[in-house]
């Protein structure tokens, strides 16, 4: 529906929604009818591109037509000729414009000399109605250029290089009803230099280099209706009447200027003034009686300014109003009652606004209101009585549901259940493997303990999804800043450092007895307990600081509704987004690199070391083995990783990242090593595989009554298990040589291969 | 405040054309129309005209307007008056003036400088 | 262009008088008349515009009034450093003219 027909239907059938709306249907708290139809939906089905009154009820009226929209259609019904490439539309097609310059377009009394290259205003016979001479190479309007035109009513000066407005440039147009200055380098406009346009009813000037206007630069425009100076370098308004030439002015935009602060004698003359645009400025303060003056005013905005403080009686007088627009300000607090006096407000933007003391009471007094606006759906609670409130969603949660997503409320049960099982599996099995090495056990068993972590923090939101399902926008900032969702969030990321930094030692560890063969010195217990124990120490620590200064880190886990902490938002605190970086862009992606590097180094190490190996076939075919295996390793981190640090990179950039992102990565991205683990550093490794055919060996030989005295394990070659190290099997353990696998590096160079495979 | 800084004397010989500048400050110089005032030993006041800085616009008086040439230097906020083909006639203080139009269609000169002393002597 | 006639070419008065200085134009100026003091060492002030509207940091001694052609400029009360001479001017229509001035002496 066209903002034009909202109007007209407004016209005829009054408001166009009601809280009790339809045939006097009454909805409870949170309900709205469906139209005339006794059935009410909640305030989450309302607006939501799906017909659920099953007669399109809920889908109507959605668009937000208030405010300037309405104004529009009211005062300036043919705006969009002013943007139409041929702004003329005579009745007759003919010229009845006397002298025409060769290069120009006439109909009727209409002269179009776009993009002709005139250098200067040029002479036509008087009786020109409309002159349009856009896209020229204009540089000034001497004196009296326009002086015969007494029945011009439009001129269209945009897209010229006018920096010099004479005093006495529009002398003379006494039938001018609109003017165009767009897109000029005009730096200032003199006092009385539209002194006789006393019919001009619209005055653009968008995008020039305007820094200063004053009360006379307007003097004359008695019918002026629409003044547009957006974009423009404006950095004060005056603090005299701003309209006491303009008596009759509705409508003032003023977007995209430098304007610090308003003054209180500013607006004090502008009493007729309807819509008033200040967006995009850098309005940094505002006095109790600013807006005083403006009671006829229907539309305010103010969205992105340097607003931190709202004087708690600065709408008071404002009972007209129908939309407001305060988004993208760093408005640190908003009064309870801030609202109380706009009782007839229809939309509230409060887009970008962290409202730490949002409350129900805030909203309650907007009777009419049908469109609210906030940083966060979870917000949206606080205003259960209006229909229409955006977000809907962050990407990851929705009104109804903590995951948004369908696939993502099956999945986190999916990989939550194959993390757990997978890690718990192998925590259980690792004593079964026969291995002399049991400090690497002890390093795998604590990575699948972290990993597991991963599993139960999957769990637990998948938990408390289905709690709130249907309703969690209830719930929404309650989970957020509760201690659930702290412990959660801490969890994963306890789970998420355990695990890398493990990965890393156990890397360096084979990266040390590989590379550098001779060096290698034996780990003993002592030390692989207490680097395992400063791991955990360490993650412990990194997970529970945001925990400890609420002050510095804010609602570090409570960003979004699955507690993690990925990418930093404007109003998250500087030290939160610090830390964050720390974690994800420092010690992870160093640990990354050193993984890959040391992965990369190792294959190098062994394919240098095989190259004087003699079964030329036999190499060939173990290395490719081995570098599927590294590949593996290395590309599992990477798939888990390069998103979480392009994400994290792209945030520091502020770049604006979709929320969807966070929950994909967190049920898709981030389990994977959580995952994968278990399977990359037990399940696929040659001991792993030999308990298995021991268990079934001797399950077979059990059965046929024949298993005495057989050897359960007897590989064909001398084999060395280097994944992730080496493990070696009792039966080739030769306790004065092969005391630590590192020792392994003893054997001659040509049986190297055999150790990955 | 605003000020007005004028060379107190100028010694010119006949012919030969003279610069006279008036450096502007504590105002918006590029926001308001700078004016030239003659006055002659024992005599009144004369508007010789009037220039603004944001577009180098000019308003010169006719009896003035082969005589005088008016300029500005934004960056300096520095006005000139050229004074071409100076006889005896042009001897006289010669001041520069902001014109106030904030009250537009109210216009005063509100600020005035000292006055340059033009001698045209040979 | 408009002249300015100032009839008075100077007055005396003392100390704590009642001073009265008077502008003809030769046509209306619709109350667009500014008065101006030059002291003797050549400074030039502004003392009141639109005909009776103060500018700013001038004592309220100093008094306009008038219309269409005829305006007047009063000191209330002589003082010392009223010692001057006073100029009219019109601000209506381009070229700005400017009276003969009147010089006020103390007796």
């Known amino acids: 529906m066209t903002s034009g027909s909202v109007f007209f239907y407004i016209l005829i059938f009054g408001k166009y929604f009601s809280h009790g709306g339809g045939q006097d249907v009454k909805c409870s708290l949170g309900y709205f009818p469906c139209g005339n139809i006794t059935k009410c939906l909640p305030q989450l089905l309302h607006c939501n591109g799906v017909d659920d009154c099953g007669n399109q009820a809920d889908e109507d009226n959605c668009g937000d037509n208030n405010g300037w929209s309405l104004q529009f259609d009211k005062y300036f019904a043919s705006y969009y000729k002013m943007t139409s490439q041929y702004p003329f539309e005579a009745e007759t097609p003919e010229c009845l414009v006397g002298s025409v310059p060769v290069q120009c377009l006439c109909q009727g009394l209409e002269l179009d000399c776009d993009e002709t290259n005139l250098r200067a205003v040029p002479s036509v016979s008087s009786n020109v109605t409309a002159m349009s001479l856009q896209w020229n190479l204009i540089r000034k309007l001497p004196p009296d250029c326009f002086k015969n035109y007494h029945d011009l009513q439009k001129l269209y000066l945009q897209n010229n290089k006018i920096t010099s407005i004479s005093i006495y440039a529009f002398r003379g147009l006494n039938s001018l009803t609109k003017l165009y200055l767009s897109h000029n380098r005009i730096t200032f406009l003199k006092p009385g230099v539209f002194e006789d346009l006393h019919r001009l009813e619209w005055l653009i000037i968008e995008d020039n280099h305007l820094s200063r206007i004053s009360p006379p630069t307007f003097y004359g425009l008695n019918s002026l209706i629409l003044l547009v100076l957006m974009n423009n370098v404006l950095t004060r308004l005056p603090d005299k009447p701003l309209c006491q030439h303009m008596p009759r002015l509705h409508w003032l935009d003023l977007e995209g200027n430098h304007i610090h602060n308003l003054r209180n004698l500013t607006f004090i003359s502008c009493s007729n003034l309807t819509v008033l645009v200040m967006r995009k400025n850098k309005i940094n303060h505002l006095n109790e009686n600013t807006f005083a003056p403006l009671q006829k005013l229907d539309e305010l905005d103010l969205g992105s300014n340097k607003i931190e403080n709202l004087p708690p009686l600065i709408f008071k007088d404002l009972k007209e109003l129908s939309q407001l627009n305060l988004s993208y300000n760093p408005i640190q607090k908003i009064q309870a009652n801030q609202f109380d006096y706009l009782v007839k407000l229809k939309s509230l933007s409060l887009e970008g606004i962290e409202i730490s003391n949002i409350q129900q009471r805030m909203f309650r007094p907007l009777m009419n209101l049908s469109h609210i606006y906030f940083k966060k759906f979870q917000y949206c609670g606080y205003a259960p009585h209006v229909r229409s409130c955006k977000p809907n969603t962050d990407g990851i949660s929705s009104l109804e549901n903590l995951l948004a997503s369908i696939i993502q409320r099956v999945f986190v049960w999916v990989v939550s259940a194959v993390t757990c099982f997978g890690n718990i599996f192998v925590i259980c099995m690792r004593p079964y493997i026969r291995s002399e090495n049991k400090l690497y056990a002890m390093s795998i068993i604590s990575l699948c303990c972290a990993d597991c972590l991963m599993g139960i923090y999957l769990f637990v939101i998948g938990g408390f999804d289905l709690k709130f399902r249907g309703e969690y926008n209830k719930h929404a900032q309650l989970w957020m800043e509760s201690t659930h969702c702290q412990l959660v969030g801490s969890l994963a990321i306890l789970s998420t450092e355990v695990s890398v930094l493990l990965l890393t030692f156990l890397t360096l560890e084979k990266y040390i007895c590989i590379v550098y063969p001779f060096r290698c010195v034996r780990p003993g217990k002592c030390r692989t307990i207490t680097v395992l124990i400063l791991i955990w120490i360490t993650g412990f620590i990194v997970a529970f600081i945001p925990l400890s200064n609420k002050e510095f880190f804010k609602n570090y886990y409570g960003t979004n509704g699955v507690c993690f902490p990925l990418h930093s938002e404007d109003t998250e605190s500087i030290g939160a987004q610090i830390y964050s970086v720390a974690i994800f862009l420092g010690i992870n992606l160093a640990a990354f690199i050193i993984i890959v590097f040391s992965y990369g180094s190792m294959f190098y190490s062994v394919h240098q070391s095989a190259i004087t190996a003699t079964e030329i076939r036999n190499q060939v075919k173990k290395e490719m083995i081995l570098a599927k295996r590294f590949f593996f390793i290395v590309f599992t981190d990477a798939l888990c990783w390069i998103p979480i640090f392009v994400v994290k990179f792209l945030s520091l950039l502020q770049v604006e990242i979709p929320g969807t992102i966070t929950s994909w990565v967190v049920i898709f991205i981030l389990p994977i090593n959580s995952a994968l683990n278990p399977i990359l550093y037990t399940l696929t490794t040659r001991p792993f595989k030999e308990m298995i055919h021991r268990f079934w060996y001797n399950y077979r030989q059990r059965k046929s009554m024949d298993s005495k005295g057989q050897k359960t394990y007897a590989p064909s070659f001398i084999w060395v298990e280097m994944w992730p190290l080496q493990e070696m099997p009792p039966e080739l353990m030769k306790p004065d040589l092969f005391t630590y696998p590192c020792e392994m590096s003893l054997i001659s160079q040509s049986t190297r291969l055999n150790s990955y495979s | 405040q605003v000020q007005l800084q004028q060379p107190g004397a100028e010694l010119v010989r006949p012919g030969a054309s003279v610069k006279l500048s008036c450096k502007a400050s504590g105002y918006s110089f590029n926001s308001y129309w700078m004016n030239w005032v003659k006055q002659r030993p024992g005599q009144g006041l004369e508007w010789i005209g009037m220039?603004?800085?944001?577009?180098?616009?000019?308003r010169l008086n006719q009896k003035f307007k082969d005589k005088a040439t008016l300029t500005a230097d934004k960056s300096s906020s520095t006005a000139y008056m050229q004074l071409s083909s100076p006889t005896s006639e042009d001897s006289a203080v010669y001041y520069c003036a902001r014109l106030d139009d904030d009250n537009y269609p109210l216009q005063s000169v509100d600020y005035w400088g000292q006055g340059t002393s033009v001698t045209v002597s040979s | 262009d408009i002249q300015m006639t100032q009839t008075t070419s100077s007055l005396s008065a003392s100390l704590g008088d009642r001073v009265t200085i008077s502008c003809r134009a030769s046509?209306?100026?619709?109350?667009?008349l500014n008065w101006y003091q030059q002291k003797p060492d050549g400074t030039v002030k502004l003392l009141i515009y639109y005909t009776s509207r103060l500018h700013s940091g001038v004592p309220s001694r100093f008094s306009g009034s008038g219309s269409g052609t005829d305006y007047s400029l009063t000191i209330s009360n002589l003082e010392q450093e009223d010692v001057a001479t006073y100029f009219c001017?019109?601000?209506?229509?381009?070229?700005?003219?400017f009276g003969a001035g009147t010089k006020l002496e103390l007796k």
């Open positions: 001017q019109q601000g209506n229509t381009l070229p700005l003219t």
């Open positions: 220039f603004h800085p944001s577009d180098s616009e000019s």
């Open positions: 046509q209306d100026i619709s109350n667009h």
